[in-house]
Amino acid sequence: KFSKQSWGLENEALIVRCPRQGKPSYTVDWYYSQTNKSIPTQERNRVFASGQLLKFLPAAVADSGIYTCIVRSPTFNRTGYANVTIYKKQSDCNVPDYLMYSTVSGSEKNSKIYCPTIDLYNWTAPLEWFKNCQALQGSRYRAHKSFLVIDNVMTEDAGDYTCKFIHNENGANYSVTATRSFTVKDEQGFSLFPVIGAPAQNEIKEVEIGKNANLTCSACFGKGTQFLAAVLWQLNGTKITDFGEPRIQQEEGQNQSFSNGLACLDMVLRIADVKEEDLLLQYDCLALNLHGLRRHTVRLSRKNPIDHHS
């Protein structure tokens, strides 16, 4: 609970925010968890704490580990954990999966690629952008604020995009790179009122208390690339992100598949360590597009484990 993964490359700047939410201006103390050693706040140190931020300027492989942050007040301390991994720079062009941020999709109408984590840094425009390690050149590519815009997107534009920028700290400059995949959706086709393939309406799913459970919300929206189509889960009518139960998470990003030429999306709801109270919740699979919204409701019921007798 209250833990977040962060990663970076050696000799680059890495800035990590305390995963425990507080309000700005509160005192935040940082510790290296393995030794319980306090992280200094003096900026002359290579690794130092600055309020809710922990700064590695620059990062080293040996910095990898778990860092504890405590947001302090006289009556209520709040503790979070940042799991930091610093990797050696690759000699070849390939960016390994563990360095990739979430995949984004684009189409001819919408082709923005945001540079991940950039809001944590003190940077100035313009950003440099690379695709599969090649610097992007030509009028089709426009670096705008913290994102890249690609004009007249084609299927060939799919690939791994890296943003590179300079973080400035007290007059010293540090390089930062971040990579994410970009996929292109085809614009051909038509759209229909959403059709939910799974789950069935008012389905009862059997789960075992204490085990993990997955629910898949799958819907089709028409043929070809769909503009404004989404599937999502709600708990008791509330978005998963707003419901705030860390054990219950939607799989980040929506998987797109083409079934019999139809454009379909699915979203997996993962419930870790199923508890009794989960059986009382209403799970709604929502599919929506420009035509409207369709909802299928699922409820969980207890599955009694089969007794094994020798």
């Epitope: 209250f2 425990r20 939410q21 507080g22 309000k23 201006s25 509160y26 005192t27 947001v71 302090r72 007040s73 006289p74 009556t75 209520f76 709040r78 509330t238 707003d242 419901f243 705030g244 139960e245 860390p246």
Partner: antibody, heavy 117, light 111 residues
């Protein structure tokens, strides 16, 4: 958006127990933060009653501690206030509110409880 | 318990003018470089709304006309310039220790 809503009887007889529930939507109360009860007698100022934090730990105002119980119902995403042996002095608007650290950033609309026979 | 005393009990201000409310604590509410004093606005029939936390930090979404200052035992909430919809009761609250306590309130009326 986080929302809090108080509910419970508007009239309680003297010496009985006042019971109120705060239903939270938009956030799971067991995920984080502290969840408070505050009251305000008609035309008067605010009095902090106590809170329960995300882990179930409670802290009460010593002036009310012997009569107060705050508990949580995780399955309904609710927390509750019980105030025993009430008198007319307990007549007030009762608010529930969320504390991120130690100021209260989200409040319910409040519910008036009158203690009268 | 820490007692918070607000003054004045009420004040009337013309739109465009400055309104100043003070809150005095019976003992210091400052420690470790922070002052654990917060300010709320309450309009009739509504719950309180957080304006300022840690003595001087503006809560998200609150207009910059509101500002807070002070440390130790003496704190001030300033509204400048006052607008017609600022008519309300204003309360200070400390969180230096348990129990949290509030001031008795200051009623701001608009002339």
């Amino acid at each position: 958006q986080v929302q809090l809503q108080e509910s419970g009887p508007g009239l309680v007889k003297p010496s009985q127990t006042l019971s109120l529930t705060c239903t939270v939507s938009g956030y799971s109360i067991t995920s984080d933060y502290a969840w408070n009860w505050i009251r305000q007698p008609p035309g008067k100022g605010l009095e902090w009653i106590g809170y329960i934090d995300y882990s179930g730990s409670t802290t009460y105002n010593p002036s009310l501690k012997s009569r107060v119980t705050i508990s949580v119902d995780t399955s309904k995403n609710q927390f509750s206030l019980k105030l025993s042996s009430v008198t007319a002095a307990d007549t007030a608007v009762y608010y529930c509110a969320r504390t991120v650290i130690d100021s209260m950033d989200y409040w319910g609309q409040g519910t008036l409880v009158t203690v009268s026979s | 318990d820490i007692v918070l005393t607000q003054s004045p009990a009420s004040l009337a201000v013309s739109p465009g003018q400055r309104a100043t409310i003070t809150c005095r604590a019976s003992k210091s509410v400052s420690t470790s470089g922070h002052s654990y004093m917060h300010w709320y606005q309450q309009k009739p029939g509504q719950p309180p709304k957080l304006l300022i936390y840690l003595a001087s930090n503006l809560e998200s979404g609150v207009p910059a006309r509101f500002s807070g200052s002070g440390s130790g035992t003496d704190f001030t909430l300033t509204i400048n310039p006052v607008e017609a919809n600022d008519a309300a009761n204003y309360y200070c609250q400390h969180s230096r220790e348990f129990p949290f306590t509030f001031g008795q309130g200051t009623k701001v009326e608009i002339k």
